[in-house]
Amino acid sequence: FVRTKIDTTENLLNTEVHSSPVQRWSMQVPAEVSAAAGDAAVLPCTFTHPHRHYDGPLTAIWRAGEPYAGPQVFRCAAARGSELCQTALSLHGRFRLLGNPRRNDLSLRVERLALADDRRYFCRVEFAGDVHDRYESRHGVRLHVTAAPRIINISVLPGPAHAFRALCTTEGEPPPALAWSGPALGNGSAAVPSSGQGHGHLVTAELPALNHDGRYTCTAANSLGRSEASVYLFRFHGASAST
């Protein structure tokens, strides 16, 4: 299920061109669209422009990250007089134009969402031919991708003084809370966010000292679900085995 929060819309003025009454450049995008990882989401974008009945060459572009300079994730071009905007770029084949640019609609569908898609997107239209003009959404639409926790790594590592420590790394949005359980453990360790990896969706918790043999379980939970993974510590002849 996809939620769209219409908050503010962009209505930014650009060059006015001979038409009466004057229709200005503007772009309407929602402040945020929210969807779950693995699902699809629609990023709405409509625009107005001052060039009445423009029928020349047209290019529709979507960028990610930042306006004007961010990497393109989608681009299509329509020839003069054509309503068919033929796709020239669709990153990983997951971006589809739902709106017809000739009808002032650049709405985009993003398929098979991943947490890495959680960023801001900016629509842009370019006119060529007799008229040379272009306009880009300045504030863009934030795509908020949610996901249940997934433990992506759990491991036992050598620690100081022949001891062992355990690390558990998970991803999810909202960021999951992590807890360790195991032999002679109380409430487990506190989770600390990782250093900026994975667009802030990674959370790592360390168990600094594994003092007893046995099974240690890392539990990750957020409002969308929970996940567990375990490692086993068996000390013999100064070595460890973990699974």
Partner: antibody, heavy 120, light 108 residues
Framework: QVQLVQSGGGVVQPGRSLRLSCAAS????????MHWVRQAPGKGLEWVAV????????YYADSVKGRFTISRDNSKNTLYLQMNSLRAEDTAVYYC?????????????WGQGTLVTVSS | QSVLTQPPSVSVAPGKTARITCGGN??????VHWYQQKPGQAPVLVIY???DRPSGIPERFSGSNSGNTATLTISRVEAGDEADYYC???????????FGGGTKLTVL
Amino acid sequence: QVQLVQSGGGVVQPGRSLRLSCAASGFTFSSYAMHWVRQAPGKGLEWVAVISYDGSNKYYADSVKGRFTISRDNSKNTLYLQMNSLRAEDTAVYYCAREGGSYYGYFDYWGQGTLVTVSS
Amino acid sequence: QSVLTQPPSVSVAPGKTARITCGGNNIGSKSVHWYQQKPGQAPVLVIYDDSDRPSGIPERFSGSNSGNTATLTISRVEAGDEADYYCQVWDSSSDHRVFGGGTKLTVL
């Protein structure tokens, strides 16, 4: 996996009404335009109607305009076709289909079809 | 409104190449999609956007589109390819979808 399960077909008298349903699963229903396509016995495929992903735009074939209404309930992941003033020539297998591409796109998944017979 | 013309039938021997055409005014400027339909079954997309193949469709199926004719080509035809084939486009003036009349492919 994507599934479109249809229901609501049957035998109906001319001039009466019938509502077809298409329950979608395995994909984000609210992000896709949906269509109805029909096929009269022994004939070819005929496009009937389309509804945009959010229900804001609807288009109909001339042969059904004013009699058929396409709608959707995104909260229930269900597509509908309300058929009024039915005629003998509306007898066909009706398919719901998902539009998989861009706005000029194709039908990448189809329902199993449901037979509507208009007869007195 | 677009009108798409297909031959009613095409016959081909196993192992040979079948070509099914779809004629329409300046169809080369449109995006053409092809469907296969076997008796009693729903249609299946075999080619989209002129020449792209959905996953699961054998490489033996290919498409082309230029001028006033789009073509579906099936190489090394097998008995299981026997079916009805339909071309389809988007009519930009009406936002309607238009199907060709269909072609029955018979494998001799």
